[in-house]
């Protein structure tokens, strides 16, 4: 999906209002310096591409993020503020349902969510205003 035509300010507002708090809850008890951030993004569409990938694509050692509250709210925000996003996610949703039934917080998941926090921070405040 090409995130170029999303309403970035509305997504930012959704993040600051709710998603950020859910990420903090997920990370509670984890030190901010515990993980090295290896994923970065260069502009807002790229940030959303990386956020979507880390949030919804199962990875080795962390298959369960898509069922977390922050993930569901992220999905809702993208569906509302990115034209045509919902349609592209139908197949992905089917696969996600098959992928995992239970929620397990592993160290790998905590590391992934730490990466997500950095990506969201970057998305919210790109130094050069990308439209």
């Amino acid at each position: 999906y090409d995130f170029t035509n999303c309403d970035f300010e509305k997504i930012k507002a959704a993040y600051l209002s709710t998603i950020s708090k859910d990420l903090i809850t997920y990370m509670s008890g984890t030190k901010s310096t515990e993980f090295n951030n290896t994923v970065s993004c260069s502009n807002r569409p790229h940030c959303l591409t990386e956020i979507q990938s880390l949030t919804f694509n199962p990875t080795a050692g962390c298959a369960s993020l898509a069922k977390e509250m922050f993930a569901m709210k992220t999905k809702a925000a993208l569906a509302i503020w990115c034209p045509g996003y919902s349609e592209t996610q139908i197949n992905a949703t089917q696969a996600m349902k098959k992928a995992r039934k239970s929620k397990v917080t592993t160290n790998k998941c905590l590391e992934q969510v730490s990466q997500l926090q950095g990506l969201w921070r970057r998305f919210n405040r790109p130094l050069l205003k990308q439209q």
Epitope: K12, A13, L16, N37, G118, R122, L127
Partner: antibody, heavy 120, light 111 residues
Framework: EAQLVQSGAEVKKPGSSVKVSCKAS????????MHWVRQAPGQGLEWIGA????????SYNQKFKDRATLTVDKSTRTAYMELSSLRSEDTAVYYC?????????????WGQGTTVTVSS | DIVLTQSPATLSLSPGERATLSCRAS??????????MHWYQQKPGQPPRLLLY???NLGSGIPARFSGSGSGTDFTLTISSLEPEDFAVYYC?????????FGQGTKLEIK
């Protein structure tokens, strides 16, 4: 605990340059915008610019665009601000500051400040 | 650039009194229903300290006697009952539009 420690006071001649350092600890340096703000004696706060350590991208106040250079060394978790062609009006306390956790655009961690005096 | 005008320049009050500081922006600092205006306190020889973010949210460790309100172009910082340690200079700052700008400051002094 997130902390920023700046280099010591500097006395410079007009026309010369100064490079102030800001060493970060207690947070993932590469993912936070780092800003520089100055304050002339008895005056208010003036934004110089910012840098994103992740890729070195910068944003400057137009007033300083030609004279200020912001850089980072990720290996030592240090941000630098170099100001060239110094004049007496550049006499000020220079602060580095970290932008907040969420990208709201406020500064939640500040360095202690570096006094730069420009005098002939 | 967005110009932030703070008033009054100096406010003389006594401990226990209520302080009301104003910050007016030359254009709106709102975006998608959020107001990107922040407030700082600065004491002599110290860096500024965050008081309030996004107009009305208390910074970490800030006492509840501090509160903020406003949206668009008009914002207010209120200190309900002044403590001796509250006498300082207060700055507003906007981030909605580059470049980031600060107000010129309001000095709160003991009467």
């Amino acid at each position: 605990e997130a902390q920023l420690v700046q280099s010591g006071a500097e006395v410079k001649k007009p026309g010369s340059s100064v490079k102030v350092s800001c060493k970060a600890s207690g947070f993932t340096f590469s993912t936070y915008n780092m800003h520089w703000v100055r304050q002339a004696p008895g005056q208010g706060l003036e934004w110089i610019g910012a840098i994103y350590p992740g890729n070195g991208e910068t944003s400057y106040n137009q007033k300083f665009k030609d004279r200020a250079t912001l850089t980072v060394d990720k290996s030592t978790r240090t941000a630098y601000m170099e100001l060239s062609s110094l004049r007496s009006e550049d006499t000020a306390v220079y602060y580095c500051a970290r932008e907040d956790d969420y990208g709201e655009g406020y500064f939640d961690v500040w360095g202690q400040g570096t006094t730069v005096t420009v005098s002939s | 650039d967005i110009v932030l005008t703070q008033s009054p320049a100096t406010l003389s009050l006594s401990p226990g009194e209520r302080a009301t500081l104003s910050c007016r922006a030359s254009e709106s600092v709102d975006s998608s229903g959020l107001s990107f205006m922040h407030w700082y306190q600065q004491k002599p020889g110290q860096p500024p300290r965050l008081l309030l973010y996004r107009a009305s949210n208390l910074g970490s460790g800030i006492p509840a006697r501090f509160s903020g309100s406003g949206s668009g172009t008009d914002f207010t910082l209120t200190i309900s009952s002044l403590e001796p340690e509250d006498f300082a200079v207060y700055y507003c700052q906007q981030i909605n539009t580059d470049p980031l700008t600060f107000g010129q400051g309001t000095k709160l002094e003991i009467k």
